[in-house]
């Protein structure tokens, strides 16, 4: 810890300015008033302090606000934010989206640090839910943010927030997360017309049930193979050859290239070879002609 030493004559800081970069650490400690620093935090960012000098400034703020910094200070932390520990941040009460944006800007272009994760957690908990503006902000800085949340956390996302989600924000989501997000997206986009609806819902379809896929197959949507390959296997299996043909439209040709991969592989195994042959794509592995198809799920339900 920096030793308490008297400020040399004439060195007492009257404002936060560039002259302070020439102060030694002990001089900063002795000559900069914490209250002055707190009121002029917005100037710190414009001054090229060394990391050691920033450590001193942080120490002064910690002494002034042992229970946690006020938002007026937090909003102007700038690069000093990088000096904060998750423990420091847990003491904060951040309610302004502008404050959140300002701090995320400091960390822009880097992976989400433990500090940022703690800040976001504090902010979202303070708001009570992940509203549209917050989601918009977070996904702009961290496209993978949504997929870093647990299904339980995602359940607090209101459907209205789904409008802020871009396709790339869902790239790393797993099926359990999409299971939670899909019904919200369906609700959010329910008043859109067919083609516009499909464009919006497409990224969320990894959580769609069979009934919805069947409904989409009647709407001339031309789902691409990349989207089809991300569908839940259990949702694809009950689809008929005709339904898959309608769902994919001109992309049905792509099934051949994917016939060894899930869910196409598993779907093929459930279809009659006769029906697969009607596609003219040479898909192999269907149920041979004359074989009886037992619906085991129905059998279980009856027994």
């Amino acid at each position: 810890e920096v030793e308490k030493t008297a400020c040399p004559s004439g060195k007492k800081a009257r404002e936060i300015d560039e002259s302070l970069i020439f102060y030694k650490k002990w001089e900063l400690e002795a000559c900069v008033d914490a209250a002055l620093l707190a009121t002029q935090m917005d100037r710190v960012n414009a001054i090229p302090f060394t990391y050691e000098q920033l450590d001193v400034l942080k120490h002064k703020l910690d002494e002034l606000y042992p229970q946690g910094y006020p938002e007026s200070v937090i909003q102007h932390l700038g690069y000093l934010f990088l000096k904060m520990s998750p423990e420091d941040i847990r003491k904060w009460n951040v309610t302004s989206l502008e404050t959140l944006k300002a701090l995320l800007e400091v960390n822009k272009g880097h992976e989400m640090s433990p500090q940022v994760a703690t800040l976001i957690d504090r902010f979202v908990k303070g708001r009570g839910q992940l509203d549209k503006d917050t989601l918009d902000t977070l996904t702009a800085f961290y496209p993978g943010y949504l997929c870093s949340l647990s299904p339980e956390e995602l359940s607090s996302v209101p459907p209205s927030s789904i409008w802020a989600v871009r396709p790339q924000d869902l790239d790393t989501c797993d099926p359990r997360q999409l299971d939670v997000l899909y019904p919200k997206a369906r609700l959010a986009f329910q008043n859109m017309n067919g083609s516009e609806y499909f464009v919006k819902i497409q990224s969320f379809l990894g959580g769609a049930p069979t009934e919805d896929l069947k409904a989409l197959s009647q709407q001339n949507v031309s789902m691409d193979l990349a989207t089809f390959m991300k569908l839940r296997t259990d949702a694809v299996l009950p689809l008929t050859v005709a339904e898959v043909q309608k769902l994919l439209g001109p992309h049905v040709e792509g099934l051949k290239a994917e016939e060894r991969h899930r869910p196409v592989r598993d779907w093929i195994l459930r279809q009659r070879q006769d029906d697969l042959d009607t596609l003219g794509l040479g898909l192999q592995g269907g149920i041979p002609n004359g074989y009886l198809v037992l619906d085991l799920s129905m059998q279980e339900a009856l027994s």
Epitope: D224, D277, G280, G282
Partner: antibody, heavy 116, light 107 residues
Framework: EVQLVESGGGLVQPGGSLRLSCAAT????????MHWVRQGPGKGLVWVSR????????VYADSVKGRFTISRDNAKNTLYLQMNSLRAEDTAVYYC?????????WGQGTLVTVSS | DIQMTQSPSSLSASVGDRVTITCRAS??????LTWYQRKPEKAPKSLIY???SLQSGVPSRFSGSGSGTDFTLTISSLQPEDFATYYC?????????FGQGAKLEIK
């Protein structure tokens, strides 16, 4: 390796007949739709006809309807095009091709010349 | 029948160039369009299907775009082996129809 080899082309007089064959190897022939496509001298590609995998459904271009017949023998892995009432404008290299609406594999073609 | 019109019918370019060929359908064909590459004495090769989906094994410098009536084939950086004739073809309805072809030559 998928291979399609056309044969049966040659010189024929207007009004005459010719039967083209396309021998398929390297894939399950009976599962695929097949097509005939032609290209006249100095011209572009023109689709002629299509047959489904089991031979129960055929489609023709208007220019050959009633004169040409597409057929297949899945036991012999062979596609056929029976061409009757041939005209000078039927002169072209004829290709057989595998696929649905998209022809992913083609043969090297066989030349049909209709001339007196 | 659906008419397919390609432009330009021929073009000259150099290795490394970005090249664009367009194809117009006489009526709405959605995304039911494919592009072929044809080299002399060789069978046509399918490059793109469903207007924008790359056939497996085709280099990523080839891309397709468009829907409805206007479509584009783009080669982002021409390679020596790309000099050929390119055809578009609709498979929305029978009879299947091709564009007249666009011959890409070395400048």
């Amino acid at each position: 390796e998928v291979q399609l080899v056309e044969s049966g082309g040659g010189l024929v007089q207007p009004g005459g007949s010719l039967r083209l064959s396309c021998a398929a190897t390297g894939f399950t022939f009976s599962s695929y739709w097949m097509h005939w496509v032609r290209q006249g001298p100095g011209k572009g590609l023109v689709w002629v006809s299509r047959i489904n995998s089991d031979g129960t459904s055929t489609v023709y271009a208007d220019s050959v309807k009633g004169r040409f017949t597409i057929s297949r023998d899945n036991a012999k892995n062979t596609l056929y095009l029976q061409m009757n009432s041939l005209r000078a404008e039927d002169t072209a290299v004829y290709y057989c091709a595998r696929g649905r609406g998209i022809m992913t594999y083609w043969g090297q073609g066989t030349l049909v010349t209709v001339s007196s | 029948d659906i008419q397919m019109t390609q432009s330009p019918s021929s073009l000259s370019a150099s290795v490394g160039d970005r090249v664009t060929i367009t194809c117009r359908a006489s009526q709405d064909i959605g995304s039911w369009l494919t592009w072929y590459q044809r080299k002399p004495e060789k069978a046509p090769k399918s490059l793109i299907y469903a207007a924008s989906s790359l056939q497996s094994g085709v280099p990523s410098r080839f891309s397709g775009s468009g829907s409805g009536t206007d479509f584009t084939l783009t080669i982002s950086s021409l390679q020596p082996e790309d000099f050929a004739t390119y055809y578009c073809q609709q498979y929305k309805s029978y009879p299947l129809t091709f564009g007249q072809g666009a011959k890409l030559e070395i400048k």
